[in-house]
Interface confidence: medium
């Protein structure tokens, strides 16, 4: 069953490459098992990014090696997505899933664009 | 840049076949679920089938399942659907549309056939292919 997500249209990334995200989706029932995939867009190419399986209440756990860092709040997840340069800009999809118990609901954010700026390097100082 | 070009449309007799080919490029299907969705003048668009190009799942909307046959051929970047026992009622300009699995269901099977056959599902859409079904 489908459900609603919603998330910011823009975000610019921080100069040391962290951007942050809130990820709210419109629960239909009381799901107890959520999981969040990141999904990231550029030109045709759909890739994850990170995903994480949360029960309400409890933190997400990402993999130990993911990009991604996340909170959960009620009916919102706040996404944190770091070590991001320039040519990772693109539209990040916020993908939700309540996993448990039945039935299963799907919700697809819009995608949030997230703009990375390479630092300029410090000029060597004499 | 993503196109999607549907061909093999044109007028049959109620009872005849027809066989619609949609050509994918700019991408190749193998991580595509492709869908063919029909409108009719005056009505909504709507999922007629569908096929997940990475695990060769298929869904069929209930009005035309045993009638038509949807598949793909990885090699040419093209889906097809077979199209038998054709009625006036499936008169229609029929689209052919793409989106990345990833943006479906996790649970492949899992409530899936709702969201291959809903449009807004889908990503790409090609510019769609007359089917006239008339004596």
């Known amino acids: 069953k489908a459900m609603h997500v919603a998330q910011p249209a823009v975000v610019l990334a921080s100069s040391r490459g962290i951007a942050s995200f809130v990820c709210e989706y419109a629960s239909p029932g009381k799901a107890t098992e959520v999981r969040v995939t990141v999904l990231r867009q550029a030109d045709s190419q759909v890739t994850e990014v990170c995903a994480a399986t949360y029960m309400m209440g409890n933190e997400l756990t990402f993999l130990d090696d993911s990009i991604c860092t996340g909170t959960s709040s009620g009916n919102q997840v706040n996404l944190t997505i770091q070590g991001l340069r320039a040519m990772d800009t693109g539209l990040y999809i916020c993908k939700v899933e309540l996993m448990y118990p039945p039935p299963y609901y799907l919700g697809i954010g819009n995608g949030t664009q997230i703009y990375v700026i390479d630092p300029e390097p410090c000029p060597d100082s004499d | 840049e993503v196109q999607l070009v549907e061909s093999g449309g044109g007028l049959v007799q109620p009872g005849g076949s027809l066989r619609l080919s949609c050509a994918a490029s700019g991408f190749t299907l193998d991580y595509y679920a492709i869908g063919w969705f029909r409108q009719a003048p005056g009505k909504e668009r709507e999922g007629v089938s569908c096929i997940d190009s990475s695990d060769g799942s298929t869904y069929y909307a209930d009005s035309v399942k045993g009638r038509f046959t949807i598949s793909r051929d990885n090699a040419k970047n093209t889906v097809y659907l077979q199209m038998n026992s054709l009625k006036p009622e499936d008169t229609a300009v029929y689209y052919c549309?793409?989106?990345?699995?990833?943006?479906?269901?996790?649970?492949?099977?899992?409530?899936?056939?709702?969201?291959?056959?809903?449009?807004?599902?889908?990503?790409?859409w090609g510019q769609g292919t007359q089917v006239t079904v008339s004596s």
């Open positions: 549309a793409a989106v990345h699995g990833l943006k479906l269901p996790t649970l492949r099977g899992l409530g899936g056939s709702y969201y291959y056959l809903q449009a807004r599902s889908y990503d790409y």
